[in-house]
């Protein structure tokens, strides 16, 4: 008879212990359908007011031509500020010639003044050649004032209206880019 | 959920040439970026290459010349072609999707480079 209580016993602590797994799993698929339905409510925000506004650039995304450039308000190393694009859809700034130049380190001026921001640019350790994330060369008036003298790899940034050199795995903000849509009327 | 499929990993020797491709399906209506990233043995995970939904590319230094990443039209498929292959670059090559805070991964596919 005991022996039947504890077995009963033990069954119903079994049956306890998947219930509670499942409340845990549905909690946890709550909390994701959540976290999705924010997203998709952001995306369709974005999609709608774009729709609306006839706008080529997503909200606090500033355009120039057909670029927009989003200035980051964190601080991070360079390999995660290209993450950061990247989840956004863009990749770190690449400056294509002195007119874009012009136009970012005058918008930055407006914006926040004198800070450094990574841009999509690194040096190769073996050659020490400098290219743009998509392996293409800088334009010669485009090269990073050399200013590092770090063992470490090396990335550029944009201060002021230069361009310079640092180790990139120092702090700072970051500009991703992408393509402006193009209005379909 | 989003899944991704990779596929053509494999053993070749060194200067070789391999292509690795990935699919993704699921409930995907729009990735913001695809593309790929490798963890060699005893080594953190490292971006090798990736796309854009717009078409912008990026590709880690230690590959630039060398590797070079595409998308299919009108697919959510991409393809990396590995040329001049390096011992270096043996590891396990994972496929990524990324939209907004939601990071995808593959399973990951083994290339190693060796004679």
């Known amino acids: 008879k005991l022996l039947q209580v504890s077995t009963i016993a033990m069954q119903q602590q079994e049956k306890l212990i998947q219930q509670e797994r499942a409340l845990l799993n549905f909690t946890e698929w709550k909390r994701s359908c959540a976290l999705q339905m924010k997203y998709c409510q952001a995306f369709m925000q974005n999609s709608l007011s774009s729709a609306h506004n006839s706008s080529p650039c997503p909200n606090n995304w500033i355009q120039n031509r057909e670029s927009c450039y989003y200035v980051s308000e964190i601080w991070s190393i360079w390999h995660t500020s290209q993450e950061n694009c990247l989840k956004e859809g863009s990749t770190l700034l690449q400056i294509e010639s002195k007119e874009e130049m012009d136009f970012i380190t005058g918008s930055l001026r407006k914006i926040k003044g004198s800070y450094d921001y990574w841009v999509g640019l690194s040096q190769d350790g073996h050659s020490g050649r400098w290219l743009w994330q998509d392996g293409s060369s800088p334009s010669p008036g485009l090269l990073p004032a050399e200013r590092s003298q770090s063992a470490n790899q090396v990335c550029g940034y944009v201060k002021s209206n230069s361009l310079l050199s640092s180790n990139c795995s120092t702090w700072k903000y970051f500009i991703c880019e992408k393509y402006a849509l193009r209005s379909s009327v | 959920d989003v899944q991704l499929v990779e596929s053509g990993g494999g053993l070749v020797q060194p200067g070789g040439s391999l292509r690795l491709s990935c699919a993704a399906s699921?409930?995907?209506?729009?990735?913001?970026?695809m593309g790929w990233y490798r963890q060699a043995p005893g080594k953190e995970r490292e971006l090798v290459a990736h796309?854009?939904?717009?078409?912008?590319?990026v590709y880690a230094d230690p590959v630039k010349g060398r590797f070079t990443i595409s998308r299919v039209d009108g697919k959510n498929m991409v393809t990396l072609q590995m040329n001049s292959l390096k011992p270096e670059d043996t590891a396990v090559y994972y496929c990524?999707?990324?939209?907004?805070?939601?990071?995808?991964w593959g399973q990951g596919t083994q290339v190693t480079v060796s004679s």
């Open positions: 990524n999707a990324k939209h907004y805070a939601s990071n995808y």
């Open positions: 796309i854009t939904s717009d078409g912008r590319i």
């Open positions: 699921g409930s995907i209506f729009s990735l913001n970026a």
